[in-house]
């Protein structure tokens, strides 16, 4: 019988409050062996993938996914899916990244330092979840780039 | 690579069906597998996907009546309370190339349900 | 909800021109746009994704360009088998959707 995978766990880095033009980098964890690490956003087909896996730690691998220069449009819920062949594994919870204006004033939340997706799952928008694995080795040129008007 | 669809035919007004994708040359688990469909002289439409642990996603309309499901090999709609309006052409297609599992790159021949009594 | 508008219907030209058709998103998509084109009586055909990417083994007589929510196919240099019909989809959006193909264009080759 193939082992249940664990789910993988997402984090931020330095955190999911993060001033327009500056860079945050999504740190994906998952078990050794893991061959493809995916970050997706809630209600898109759309995801990043990366088979530049390295070991965190004897028993925990990760992989890093870096927007430069953040936009309004990369606000929103990220999540994190891992293929160890055969099988993928379930998404992460949600993790909320949050785009503030650098011109804020006392009022603005500072830089939430080194958060990750907390034990709640974030609920869907409906009873269907969203997303996930397609080809191996597939990479994009960029992430999430453009705004959003919804 | 390829994907063909069976289990199209005449049904009754009311009725259940439920259509298979099967896949050869690859695995449907790594991909999104999506469900399009197209009444005849009509355009695509489509249905919904399914991808990794049995997620699934569906259009707004398909909500409740349509149900993706999987094997290692084969990919299922079941479609229930049909009405004349599914008549069509069913289309089982691969997702996932360009990090869109949008981007269909695979389709297969199309299966036909007739819904009439 | 986001939709997908396609234009025109239908456009006809003679062998050696060339076909304009928009597509037109109701929010912002970026590029995350895909062109097919179908055949009477055949699955449908990648053409393009990411807006302007071409699909393996497609001609380079197939363009595509366009951002956030215009998007354009051009076809250029027209042949008989171009003759088809031809759809957007969005390929961003699977939350919240009547549909992801715009209506279709036809493509008549004179």
């Known amino acids: 019988q193939e082992e249940d995978l664990p789910r993988p766990s997402i984090s931020a880095e330095p955190g999911t409050v993060i001033p327009l033009g500056s860079h945050v980098t999504f740190v994906c964890r998952g078990p050794v062996g893991v061959q493809t690490f995916r970050l997706e956003r809630e209600s898109r087909s759309t995801y990043n993938d990366t088979e530049d896996v390295s070991q965190a730690s004897p028993s925990e691998s990760e992989a890093r996914f870096r927007i430069d220069s953040v936009s309004e449009g990369n606000a929103g819920p990220y999540r994190c899916i891992y293929y160890k062949p055969p099988k993928w594994s379930e998404q992460s919870d949600y993790l909320e990244l949050l785009v503030k204006e650098t011109s804020g004033g006392p009022d603005s939340p500072d830089t939430e330092p080194g958060s990750s997706a907390g034990p709640t799952q974030r609920p869907s928008d409906n009873s269907h979840n969203e997303h996930a694995p397609a080809s191996q080795g597939l990479k994009a040129e960029h992430l999430y780039h453009h705004h959003h008007h919804h | 690579e390829q994907s063909v669809e069976s289990g199209g035919g005449l049904i009754t007004p009311g009725g259940t069906l439920t259509l298979t994708c099967t896949a050869s040359g690859f695995t449907v688990t790594r991909y999104y597998m999506n469900w399009v469909r197209q009444a005849p002289g009509k355009g695509l439409e489509w249905i919904g996907y399914?991808?990794?642990?049995?997620k699934t996603y569906y259009a707004n309309w398909a909500k409740g009546r349509f149900t993706i499901s999987k094997t290692s090999t084969t990919v299922d709609l079941k479609m229930t309370s049909l009405t004349a309006e599914d008549t069509g052409t069913y289309f089982c297609?691969?997702?996932?190339?360009?990090?869109?599992?949008?981007?269909?790159?695979?389709w297969g021949p199309g299966t036909l349900v007739t819904i009439s009594s | 909800e986001l939709d997908m508008t396609q234009t025109p219907a239908s456009v006809s030209e003679p062998v050696g021109g060339t076909v304009t058709i928009k597509c037109q998103a109701s929010?912002?998509?970026?590029?995350?746009l895909a062109w097919y084109q179908q055949k009477p009586g055949q699955p449908p055909k990648l053409l393009i994704y990411?807006?302007?990417r071409l699909a393996s083994g497609v001609s380079s007589r197939f363009g595509g360009s366009g951002s956030g929510t215009e998007f354009t196919l051009t076809i250029s240099d027209l042949e008989c088998a171009d003759a088809a019909t031809y759809y957007c989809q969005q390929a961003e959006y699977s939350g919240d959707v009547e549909n992801t193909f715009g209506g279709g264009t036809e493509v008549v080759v004179k």
């Open positions: 929010q912002s998509i970026g590029s995350w």
């Open positions: 399914i991808y990794a642990s049995s």
């Open positions: 297609a691969r997702g996932g190339v360009g990090n869109s599992g949008l981007n269909l790159d695979l």
């Open positions: 990411q807006a302007s």
